[in-house]
């Protein structure tokens, strides 16, 4: 048990286990929406230079890939897996890898993934062959 842990009135932010140690937030790529050259590839790097400390300890890393008539974008953020994002549930939020899954959206091709390892949304996977791979 730590010799000193600050008190908190916000148990949602102050997450600790039975041992008294305080849970860390995740580290995720967080560039919001950026133009991307990722297209027709089995996997891509985010090319996001910002690794942010997520605001709350239960947040996970998320990536959203979108393609329409005009451009391709990649969005990288932290997000609470209990809440929807762009109207969709975050599937596989406990996964160590960010494996993209297509979502139905009018007027664009839309893929989203969530994962829970440091900077896991830096490497996004489209190929189905990766979906059964085990954590590193």
């Amino acid at each position: 048990i730590p010799p000193h842990v600050p008190k908190s009135v916000n148990s949602d932010v102050m997450a600790s286990d039975n041992g008294g140690a305080v849970k860390l937030p995740q580290l995720c790529k967080f560039c919001d929406v950026r133009l991307s050259t990722c297209d027709n590839q089995k996997s891509c790097m985010s090319n996001c230079s910002i690794t942010a400390i997520c605001e709350k300890p239960h947040e996970v890393c998320v990536a959203v890939w979108r393609k329409n008539d005009k451009n391709i974008t990649l969005e990288t953020v932290c997000h609470d897996p209990k809440l929807t994002y762009h109207g969709f549930t975050l599937e596989d939020a406990a996964s160590p890898k960010c494996v993209m899954k297509e979502k139905k959206r009018a007027g664009e091709t839309f893929f989203m993934c969530a994962c829970n390892m440091e900077e896991c949304n830096d490497y996004i996977i489209f190929s189905e062959e990766y979906t059964t791979s085990s954590p590193d």
């Epitope: 286990d17 140690a21 305080v22 849970k23 860390l24 580290l27 300890p57 239960h58 390892m117 440091e118």
Partner: nanobody
Framework: EVQLLESGGGLVQPGGSLRLSCAAS???????RMWWVRQAPGKGLEWVS?????????YYARSVFGRFTISRDNSKNTLYLQMNSLRAEDTAVYYC?????????????????WGQGTLVTVSS
């Protein structure tokens, strides 16, 4: 015995600067990722910044990007936080914390030791 001792807090005007220090002892400083965490009055914890033990790779909360700089001097077992362009909302007790080793999975990642904190007040 692990000890983390913060210093450098105080009263500063908005737009001003402060440099916090955290003197570490009782463990091998060069083996651990270190963090600065803050708690504003009546609020929860906010994870401000972290730095790797070797290579000095750094991470920041989005609320402090471009204003705060974390650094460490492994030869002195000391962690630093340079805070510039301070705002009223930066008012908080600032703690340095040691991360438990070798955990990249969020569910297993923990802080195991904390300092007693140093108070930073930003007010005109």
């Amino acid at each position: 015995e692990v000890q983390l001792l913060e210093s450098g807090g105080g009263l500063v005007q908005p737009g001003g600067s402060l440099r916090l220090s955290c003197a570490a002892s009782g463990f091998t400083f060069t083996e651990y990722r270190m963090w600065w965490v803050r708690q504003a009055p009546g609020k929860g914890l906010e994870w401000v910044s972290a730095i790797e033990p070797i290579g000095n790779r750094t991470y920041y909360a989005r609320s402090v990007f471009g204003r705060f700089t974390i650094s460490r001097d492994n030869s002195k077992n000391t962690l630093y936080l340079q805070m510039n362009s301070l705002r009223a909302e930066d008012t908080a007790v600032y703690y340095c914390a040691k991360q438990m080793p070798g955990q990249k999975w969020m569910a297993k990642s923990r802080f195991d030791y904390w300092g007693q904190g140093t108070l930073v007040t930003v007010s005109s």
